[in-house]
Interface confidence: medium
Amino acid sequence: LEVSESPGSIQVARGQPAVLPCTFTTSAALINLNVIWMVTPLSNANQPEQVILYQGGQMFDGAPRFHGRVGFTGTMPATNVSIFINNTQLSDTGTYQCLVNNLPDIGGRNIGVTGLTVLVPPSAPHCQIQGSQDIGSDVILLCSSEEGIPRPTYLWEKLDNTLKLPPTATQDQVQGTVTIRNISALSSGLYQCVASNAIGTSTCLLDLQVISPQPRNIG
């Protein structure tokens, strides 16, 4: 019995279905086929869980969190024992193993390993201004999303005809900050933060209005 090489790792957007491949070759009939799918979750590497089981011509549920979401992609028994996981959750991220036994065919590699990573688009980021908006001051524009896998990067754009930030601005796309030094009336306007990762984009807007000093009345 020989389980074929797996693709190594699979990435899927949260909520989308995932197919975990596992195929094998055997010299024996599939009368005594036994397939166990296990997962070692990334969130709890010390606690492997059973995903689904095929034994004695019957299918059995694994851990409760997979109930109703997991099944074999084809009619069993078969040499393709790939499974699907519907409505993937962040907690489904982990290393999946298919263990295949088909007596009397013993020997060879009977385990296939596939990594599953569930990706999450950035949640709507929060935009805020730090510092005084008085003319001549330094301000920091802050942007962060609570969710996002892979970790989002942040891009600030000024929503005018150029879209580029003023020359006095320095941007940190990892932290989501923009520092604008010595703000002037030209710094005023609508700024957009774009949080993005491999599977999604989300934005927030911020209106920076630079305050000019009020002329003092004399006398």
Epitope: A13, L155, E157, N161, V194, G200
Partner: antibody, heavy 123, light 108 residues
Framework: EVQLVESGGGLVKPGGSLRLSCAAS????????MSWVRQAPGKGLEWVGR??????????DYAAPVKGRFTISRDDSKNTLYLQMNSLKTEDTAVYYC??????????????WGQGTLVTVSS | SYELTQPPSVSVSPGQTASITCSGD??????ASWYQQKPGQSPVLVIY???KRPSGIPERFSGSNSGNTATLTISGTQAEDEADYYC???????????FGGGTKLTVL
């Protein structure tokens, strides 16, 4: 894998209408800003229009040559982008591509692109 | 309306450096992107935000943008780089993309 597949192209008479579809997969479509770009036979690329995600207002913008004739819409439940083309002219003949606005709101470029669908306007 | 100008064609020998320019009024104040299109295929983004490379694009592709000119540089050009290249800028907040006329890169 991020994928975009256009359909709905074909031959139409001047003044006629056509609706193109773009089926998206491999990313969270509802979060994405999407765009249409066209390419006349043997010519360069021409931006047609863009639609923002619903969370960003779902607003649309169009290039001057198509404004008032073309309408971009989206059905997030079907992961599908649409281009409704009315009052078609011979100069609208082109391969129409849908593309995702990536790496930033306005400034990140279009990535990926679909395979394109050919629209021929001729009497 | 905003216009971007590219040379119609550029030739380069394999292994040499190819430079494709794109000019427009105060283009350096805007973001520039570059697309590669091979015959019969869809365009592929190779550079965005002036100089950033999407994942999967080889390191030999680089970009710069200042003044009135954006430049796409392909160092150690390979035969597979032969294609049409289009520059694009962000136009305005209501014009997502303005494209140049395209440059045919020939690898001799």
């Amino acid at each position: 894998e991020v994928q975009l597949v256009e359909s709905g192209g074909g031959l139409v008479k001047p003044g006629g209408s056509l609706r193109l579809s773009c089926a998206a997969s491999g990313f969270t479509f509802s979060n994405a800003w999407m765009s249409w770009v066209r390419q006349a036979p043997g010519k360069g690329l021409e931006w047609v229009g863009r639609i923002k995600s619903k969370t960003d207002g779902g607003t649309t913008d169009y290039a001057a040559p198509v404004k008032g004739r073309f309408t971009i819409s989206r059905d997030d439940s079907k992961n599908t982008l649409y281009l409704q083309m009315n009052s078609l002219k011979t100069e609208d003949t082109a391969v129409y591509y849908c593309a995702r606005v990536a790496h930033g709101g306005y400034s990140g470029g279009l990535d990926p692109w679909g395979q394109g669908t050919l629209v021929t306007v001729s009497s | 309306s905003y216009e971007l100008t590219q040379p119609p064609s550029v030739s380069v020998s394999p292994g040499q450096t190819a430079s494709i320019t794109c000019s427009g009024d105060k283009l350096g104040d805007k973001y520039a992107s570059w697309y590669q299109q091979k015959p019969g295929q869809s365009p592929v983004l190779v550079i965005y935000q002036d100089s950033k490379r999407p994942s999967g694009i080889p390191e030999r592709f680089s970009g710069s943008n200042s003044g009135n000119t954006a430049t796409l540089t392909i160092s150690g050009t390979q035969a597979e780089d032969e294609a049409d290249y289009y520059c694009s800028s962000t136009g305005t907040a209501h014009t997502l993309a303005v494209f140049g006329g395209g440059t045919k890169l020939t690898v001799l």
